[in-house]
């Protein structure tokens, strides 16, 4: 399907809105430090030169990839070396090399101050004033935070940001309006970014074939009583997209995700029953809805997998003949009998499967070899099943809070090297997982949980690959994708670590602290808490909870006092004595 | 060993109710399928009702809207609840689940229904 010139193919297939929008997100991923200007007169740049190119598909430079096309613009850039160092070293190399070097240094940690909502009157008057360049600022605001964030799914969130401000901008409360909207945003914002980092890590760091396996679990579970024939054709298409928007090719992946949501409601019949209302909609709203759709009904007969995988002479035959799409098979009907399974147990019991297959059937009985075989799933089952069932019993004993605190001690102690930021950000979400899973019926936690934690731990992977200092971290991390979070389980203290030397400034405090949101205030304490435990890596829940709970009574009694800084300045050098003798 | 548990049968008046339940032990596997069969004196085995890990359910037109099939995840149990009776339903009533090694049945227990 080659066309004369990329970009006019391209700008004609996607519209020019969704086309600016989304060269403005990949020039925003790309130089993150770049002004808001700066980016939009590139846009416009390129966005003229499209229409040059639709409008004559033979005019010059319009037959340029789309790499060369857009690197070429990025590296016209001027303060390049000054504001991004050696990625301007880029700009001297030629495609494709050039976009993986731009790849290369993308920033999943910019130094960028954190977003400031203004006023809700102040944004409605901008929102007003200019409504384009409002929604820009969304696109750049964001896209330049989260540089792998799922192009074509951040423009849905830009649409929606707009219906939020048209809506509540005429509202006669607009605040009680606008902001539940905008934290639902927010949060949905940061978990989708989080959940496509997984997604480009998998891609990234462990191929295609790991993120083909992770699909055919997934879309089985979703869709089965779809054929595996089927299955296969969604889990290639999604394959290529993702491949796309990871490598920033984010014109070709919307592009292609929009004809993969044509294809599925087109196929709605062969593929699952639950595609009907989200086939009505608008296209963002549509591949939105498809994305996220229900579980479809089981079949009601689908017969036990012995016969097929177990107790056949075949075994062998079938596996040598198509390794791959034996294996599939297998992870698809596995998936589709077990929506209440994770993704990643489903993957760890199809590497399992894999692992005996090519044990036995190299052996002299292979039958006799792997007859056993689904008695090695035993503990893999077990594992995480025991883990959602423990967490969830101390998630309910203690509430959010102290439930992250409980983690921010864990996680501490087996990578005390990790930053304090990090460790804190990582355990306040890992710490999420209560009150988005333990509250659902038994039979969807597992998902739910382990799934989402494998999300985080990502998080984790990622800050630290930027820089590295544990080798725990970088082995739990590096070694398998699918073992990742059972690896975290399984680190204990690590008794090689020399504890921080105590520094009384980190464990002073200000009247500041009296001001702070109750989120922020929960912050300050837990990096209080990771640095304890730094510095105390041996120290019981009973001595650390003794501090917190006196360093949360000196707080109080400080934000109540009249002259509140003298307070912090008497009381603090006492807090800090007494949790010394206490921790001694 | 898989070890099925079944109780809950006896007699009851015609537009009574009886609840039957089955509680499965000795799997390293979830129960992907649990379901209720019946054989009256006879006849051919029949399926009652099953329900589904995502708790799909399907039941036999003659039961529909009587009969109520449930399961307790975390206990691996599989009840039916059966109401207004008719003598129609008398006969033993088996359990079945499965996993992805096998099918299992149950023992059976009696349901009589009569005035």
């Known amino acids: 399907d080659t066309h004369k010139s990329e970009v006019a193919h391209r700008f004609k297939d996607l519209g020019e809105e969704h086309f600016k929008g989304l060269v403005l997100v990949a020039f925003s991923q790309y130089l993150q430090q770049c002004p808001f200007e700066e980016h939009v007169k590139l846009v416009n740049e390129v966005t003229e030169f499209a229409k040059t190119c639709v409008a004559d598909e033979s005019a010059e430079n319009c037959d340029k990839s789309l790499h060369t096309l857009f690197g070429d613009k990025l590296c016209t850039v001027a303060t390049l070396r000054e504001t991004y160092g050696e990625m301007a070293d880029c700009c001297a190399k030629q495609e494709p090399e050039r976009n993986e070097c731009f790849l290369q240094h993308k920033d999943d940690n910019p130094n960028l101050p954190p977003l400031v909502r203004p006023e809700v009157d102040v944004m409605c008057t901008a929102f007003h004033d200019n409504e384009a360049t409002f929604l820009k600022k969304y696109l750049y605001e964001v896209a330049r935070r989260h540089p792998y964030f799922y192009a074509p799914e951040l423009l849905f969130f830009a649409a929606r940001y707009k219906a939020a401000f048209a809506e509540c901008c005429q509202a006669a409360d607009k605040a009680a309006c606008l902001l539940p909207k905008l934290d639902e945003l927010r949060d949905e914002g940061k978990a989708s970014s989080a959940k496509q980092r997984l997604k480009c890590a998998s891609l990234q760091k462990f191929g295609d074939r790991a993120f083909k396996a992770w699909a055919v679990a997934r879309l089985s579970q979703k869709f089965p009583k779809a054929e595996f024939a089927e299955v296969s054709k969604l889990v290639t298409d999604l394959t290529k997209v993702h491949t796309e928007c990871c490598h920033g090719d984010l014109l070709e992946c919307a592009d292609d995700r929009a004809d993969l949501a044509k294809y599925m409601c087109e196929n709605q019949d062969s593929i699952s029953s639950k595609l009907k209302e989200c086939c009505d909609k608008p296209l963002l709203e549509k591949s939105h809805c498809l994305a996220e759709v229900e579980n479809d009904e089981m079949p009601a007969d689908l017969p036990s997998l012995a016969a097929d995988y177990v107790e056949s002479k075949d075994v062998c035959k079938n596996y040598a003949e198509a390794k791959d799409v034996f294996l599939g098979m297998f992870l698809y009907e596995y998936a589709r009998r077990h929506p209440d399974y994770s993704v990643m147990l489903l993957l760890r019991l199809a590497k399992a499967y894999e692992a005996t297959l090519e044990k036995c059937c190299a052996a002299a009985d292979p039958h006799e070899c792997y007859a056993k075989v689904f008695d090695e799933f035993q503990p893999l089952v077990e594992e995480p099943q025991n883990l959602v069932k423990q967490n969830c019993e101390l998630f309910e004993q203690l509430g959010e809070y102290k439930f992250q605190n409980a983690l921010l001690v864990r996680y501490t102690k087996k990578v005390p090297q990790v930053s304090t930021p990090t460790l804190v950000e990582v355990s306040r979400n890992l710490g999420k997982v209560g009150a988005k899973c333990c509250k659902l019926p038994e039979a969807k936690r597992m998902p739910c949980a382990e799934d989402y934690l494998s999300v985080v731990l990502n998080r984790l992977c990622v800050l630290h690959e930027k820089t590295p200092v544990s080798e725990k971290v970088t082995k739990c991390c590096t070694e398998s994708l699918v073992n990742r979070r059972p690896c975290f389980s399984a680190l204990e203290l690590d008794e090689a670590y020399v504890p921080k030397a105590f520094n009384a400034e980190t464990f002073t405090f200000h009247a500041d602290m009296c001001t702070l949101s109750e989120k922020e205030k929960q912050v300050k304490k837990q990096t209080a808490l990771v640095e304890l435990v730094k510095h105390k890596p041996k120290a019981t829940k009973e001595q650390l909870k003794g501090v917190m709970d006196n360093f949360a009574a000196f707080v109080e009694k400080c934000c109540k006092a009249d002259d509140k800084e003298a307070c912090f300045a008497e009381e603090g050098p006492k807090f800090v004595a007494a949790s010394q003798a206490a921790l001694a | 060993q898989v070890q099925l548990q079944e109780s809950g049968g006896g007699l009851v008046q015609p537009g009574g109710s009886l609840r039957l339940s089955c509680a499965a032990s000795g799997s390293i596997f979830t129960f992907y399928r649990m379901a209720w069969y019946r054989r009256a004196p006879g006849k051919e085995r029949e399926l009652v009702a099953l329900?589904?890990?995502?708790?799909?359910?399907n039941y036999a037109d003659s039961v529909k809207g009587r009969f109520t099939i449930s399961r307790d995840y975390a206990k691996n149990t599989v009840y039916l609840q059966m109401d207004s009776l008719k003598p129609e339903d008398t006969a033993a009533y088996y359990c079945?689940?499965?996993?992805?090694?096998?099918?299992?049945w149950g023992q059976g227990t009696q349901v009589t229904v009569s005035s």
């Open positions: 079945n689940v499965r996993n992805v090694e096998r099918d299992y």
């Open positions: 329900i589904t890990t995502d708790t799909s359910t």
